[in-house]
Amino acid sequence: EQAPGTAPCSRGSSWSADLDKCMDCASCPARPHSDFCLGCAAAPPAPFRLLWP
C-alpha cells in the first residue's frame, strides 16, 4: 500500500509502510513476512530474456 505523498516505487520494489520506504522485492523469497512483499506479488519484477530457445 503506497503511503500518501510518496513517489511510486521503482519496478522490482514495493512500498513498506513498516519502514516508510520502498524495498527490493528480491528479498521476499527469503523473508516472506515483510509487509512490502504483498505489493511484490501484485507487481512482479521486470521480465528477463531466456538464454535458450
Epitope: 509502510a17 519502514l19 516508510d20 520506504k21 523473508r31 516472506p32 515483510s34 509487509d35
Partner: antibody, heavy 123, light 111 residues
Framework: QVSLKESGPGILQPSQTLSLTCSFS??????????VSWIRQPSGKGLEWLAH???????RYNPSLKSRLTISKDTSRNQVFLKITSVDTADTATYYC???????????????WGQGTSVTVSS | DIVLTQSPASLAVSLGQRATISCRAS??????????MHWYQQKPGQPPKLLIK???NLESGVPARFSGSGSGTDFILNIHPVEEEDAATYYC?????????FGGGTKLEIK
C-alpha cells in the same frame, strides 16, 4: 552476538549541541534492510523515537524535532551518530540506540537496544 | 501522530494470576493483512526488551506466558501465569507510519 553501546558527553549547557555515538557489533549496517534508531527517555517517563538511518543512508526523523536533529553513520567503523542542536533542559534524558533489521521471517523489529547513555542539560 | 494510550497506568496482580494490559491507538495501525503493533518490557535501570512483534509474534527467548492480540486500534498484552520476574513497565509501540510512537507505559506490580 549483537550488541550496541551509546556514548555521550554526560553533561552540557543549554544552547549547546549534543553529540551522541552508537557503537555496535554483531551485525553490519551495509546489510540490506538494516537500520539503527535513536530513542530517548526522560527519567521516570516514557519513550520517544527520534531518528532512524538505513543501510543505504536514507534517514527519517521525528517531525517534532526534525529541525534540530542530524543522524549519520560510519559503516566501516560500525557507528551511528546523532546530533541535537540548541539543547534545553527538556532534552535531559537517557538516550538509547536500537537496531531495526530483518529477522528470519522478514519482520523488522527493534530487537536489540543499547544500555543507554544519560545526558543532563544544565546551566 | 498516532497516539497510543495504555491502560491501566499501573496494576497489581497476584502471583500466578493473569495480567492484561491494553493499548489503544488514535487511528488504525493495521492493514487488511498486517498489524504494526509491538510490546516491550522495561525493568529499572535497563533498556526496553522486545517481547512481541507485529501484534502476536513472540520474540525468540520470551516465555510463552506472554501473548498479544488485537487489530485496528485495540491491542492487548496478556501475561499468564504472572511470575515475580515479570514486575516491570510495559510499553506498546507502532510502526504503521512515521513518527513511530510509544504508549505511556503500564507498571506491573506482583502481589
Amino acid at each position: 552476538q549483537v550488541s550496541l553501546k551509546e556514548s555521550g558527553p554526560g553533561i552540557l549547557q543549554p544552547s549547546q549541541t549534543l553529540s551522541l555515538t552508537c557503537s555496535f557489533s554483531g551485525f553490519s549496517l551495509s546489510t540490506s534492510g538494516m537500520g539503527v534508531s535513536w530513542i530517548r527517555q526522560p527519567s521516570g517517563k516514557g519513550l520517544e523515537w527520534l531518528a532512524h538511518i538505513y543501510w543505504d543512508d536514507d534517514k527519517r526523523y521525528n517531525p517534532s524535532l526534525k529541525s534540530r536533529l542530524t543522524i549519520s553513520k560510519d559503516t566501516s567503523r560500525n557507528q551511528v551518530f546523532l546530533k541535537i542542536t540548541s539543547v534545553d533542559t527538556a532534552d535531559t534524558a537517557t538516550y538509547y540506540c536500537a537496531r531495526r533489521g530483518p529477522d528470519y521471517y522478514g519482520y523488522y523489529p527493534m530487537d536489540y537496544w543499547g544500555q543507554g547513555t544519560s545526558v543532563t542539560v544544565s546551566s | 501522530d498516532i497516539v497510543l494510550t495504555q491502560s491501566p497506568a499501573s496494576l497489581a496482580v497476584s502471583l500466578g494470576q493473569r495480567a492484561t494490559i491494553s493499548c489503544r491507538a488514535s487511528k488504525s495501525v493495521s492493514t487488511s493483512s498486517y498489524s504494526y503493533m509491538h510490546w516491550y518490557q522495561q525493568k529499572p535501570g535497563q533498556p526496553p526488551k522486545l517481547l512481541i512483534k507485529y501484534t502476536s509474534n513472540l520474540e525468540s527467548g520470551v516465555p510463552a506466558r506472554f501473548s498479544g492480540s488485537g487489530s485496528g486500534t485495540d491491542f492487548i498484552l496478556n501475561i499468564h501465569p504472572v511470575e515475580e520476574e515479570d514486575a516491570a513497565t510495559y510499553y506498546c509501540q507502532h510502526s504503521r507510519e512515521l513518527p513511530w510512537t510509544f504508549g505511556g507505559g503500564t507498571k506491573l506490580e506482583i502481589k
